[in-house]
Amino acid sequence: IRAEKAMVDGSWLDLAKRSKLEAQPFAHLTINATNIPTGSHKVSLSSWYHDRGWAKISNMTFSNGKLIVNQDGFYYLYANICFRHHETSGDLATEYLQLMVYVTKTSIKIPSSHTLMKGGSTKYWSGNSEFHFYSINVGGFFKLRSGEEISVEVSNPSLLDPDQDATYFGAFKVRDID
Amino acid sequence: IRAEKAMVDGSWLDLAKRSKLEAQPFAHLTINATNIPTGSHKVSLSSWYHDRGWAKISNMTFSNGKLIVNQDGFYYLYANICFRHHETSGDLATEYLQLMVYVTKTSIKIPSSHTLMKGGSTKYWSGNSEFHFYSINVGGFFKLRSGEEISVEVSNPSLLDPDQDATYFGAFKVRDID
Amino acid sequence: IRAEKAMVDGSWLDLAKRSKLEAQPFAHLTINATNIPTGSHKVSLSSWYHDRGWAKISNMTFSNGKLIVNQDGFYYLYANICFRHHETSGDLATEYLQLMVYVTKTSIKIPSSHTLMKGGSTKYWSGNSEFHFYSINVGGFFKLRSGEEISVEVSNPSLLDPDQDATYFGAFKVRDID
């Protein structure tokens, strides 16, 4: 009986450990600044790091600029987007800016895209100021199904701060779907 | 056998409960306004409450102004920083401000400090306005090792809002490292 | 013995699954714009969706404009509040605004209300500009007891963005109280 109990304990420990880790996908993706689009229109950001510096991914997939869900569950999603401009890098096209982020979910089965979270601000960035900076943070708790894709759109991509501590987004699974 | 089963169930319940709680360190630290530095330069904030009001800590350590990780894991880190100025508290040294927060990680083994998250905004706080306020929120998911330290730096510390609901930072463990 | 072991495994699997799901209440509530108060004073927002679009709730209760905790625990709370104004919707009463959010906790046992988190900004929304936008995000980790209520107060409710991706708040349980 003791041997059986040990076996129960052992197998349970494995199962618990394994299931716990398997049950918790996550990603933290940081901007890849070598490929940021120009212009001031709203664009989907497709270049992100997933395996250097703070960037990491587990039990999720990064493909074609989208974070793909591999496991059904409730996830906490977040994004931090920093915009900046220094006069030494050129002029602003306009001093009145709409600096925005949109975190969207795309379902492949039903080809449709929906915004989960948005944030930002209209700003007056005077051409007379040497330096401008503004950050947006959004976060929320969402049900995601395997195969669904998360992407990030921003306005004025040419103003993005390319640092890994500045412009990033991520997700981590909190619980299963009942 | 029933006794053995009860023993298995009982020990497992204890183990599950214990391991679950042990596996989830957290901290929510609120600003200690009795010791906020003056000036407008970037400074590390070292005075935080960990055991009064909303402030709390478990399975992490607060020492020398830093939040110390005691347990390897993936953590969600966050900070909320509020800046404010009322004309009754005197004039601003300058109307053009850079209000910023930097959440940094320091590794003792390899003495180095790296910024995990940053946020903020450049602001024009006109002397003609009676009151000014601005808040920053940042959050992200990071791998932390035992012994690593989390600290918060801000610009213009003299403008910090000293309320516990305004200026705080924290962390909670989400999962183990594989 | 094998039968007993199967019974142990089976009951454990049920228990683990059941306890895991039961241990993780959550809510994501989105603004119900059909009933937003007018004016510029600080008001408690009482109309939220809990079961349409992104809005959902489990093991928590939404009643009388408040999110009620049904299970003791440590929760991560968050709110995202967007304000906007377009000139086509009329003039602003004042160009100098204080756009704020307060996430509060009310204890029924001891009838008192306390602010857990606040954020926002003073803004100058010039009448010369066609469109204005501003978002606030706050988040933090708090101990909540069964029966406690979470509510959201904002200034200038008439300026709230009514989209479900714009104005929302939520909570999810991270761990039990020791």
Partner: antibody
């Protein structure tokens, strides 16, 4: 290094139009306002206006609004100024110019002389 | 439009002496903690060259004999000591506000 190369001198009849060009190199054409300045013989400098080549935004001094039209060809990194309904008052040297990295007009084209004569 | 008035219209200065040129703006050209006033030198048949930017900053490659000062509405360009090569016309310019404007110019002659 930043260079602004302007087109050659123009001789035009009153009432006609001319289109001056300014070919840029050594920097990202779409990220700076490209300015135009007029100088009549023996006179001072007058700011005409500027174009932001990315989206093609323009700004003008009031007196030149009906006189000058600023355009840009992003693919050729070239800015243009068309002067219409020419009169003798439009006889001048026209400069294209760009600000320095820290303000002030640090970069100038060599100038294009426009002569309006019957 | 901001009007810039330069004085004197012309001046003659002996070699090695100090030359001072004034520029007065019809309204302040200060914003964001800086003065948006610049100084240029122009020799006949040449485009202008930037000497001083933001009221007091010496442009790269410009001799330290040139200096600028002032704020809000009153600005000064100083050349000390003057050299023969400095004979030219000097212009002030503001870019604090559209449309940008130039002063009428000051012609410097070396005696």
């Amino acid at each position: 290094q930043v260079q602004l190369q302007q087109s050659g001198a123009e001789l035009a009849s009153p009432g006609a139009s001319v289109k001056l060009s300014c070919k840029t190199s050594g920097y990202t054409f779409t990220t700076y306002w490209l300015q135009w300045v007029k100088q009549r013989p023996g006179q001072g400098l007058e700011w005409i206006g500027a174009i932001y080549p990315g989206p093609g935004n323009t700004k003008y001094t009031q007196k030149f609004k009906d006189k000058a039209t600023l355009t840009a060809d992003k693919s050729a990194s070239t800015a243009y100024m068309q002067l219409s309904s020419l009169t003798s008052e439009d006889s001048a040297v026209y400069y294209c110019a760009r600000r320095g990295s820290r303000r002030g007009i640090a970069y100038w084209g060599q100038g294009t002389l426009v002569t309006v004569s019957a | 439009n901001i009007v810039l008035t330069q004085s004197p219209a012309s001046l003659a200065v002996s070699l090695g002496q100090r030359a001072t040129i004034s520029c007065r703006a019809s309204e302040s050209v200060d914003s964001y903690g800086r003065s948006f006033m610049h100084w240029y030198q122009q020799r006949p048949g040449q485009p202008p060259t930037l000497l001083i930017y933001l009221a007091s900053n010496l442009e790269s490659g410009v001799p330290a004999r040139f200096s600028g000062s002032g704020s809000r509405t009153d600005f000064t360009l100083t050349i000390d000591p003057v050299e023969a090569d400095d004979a030219a016309t000097y212009y002030c310019q503001q870019d604090n506000e559209d449309p940008y404007t130039f002063g009428g110019g000051t012609k410097l002659e070396i005696k």
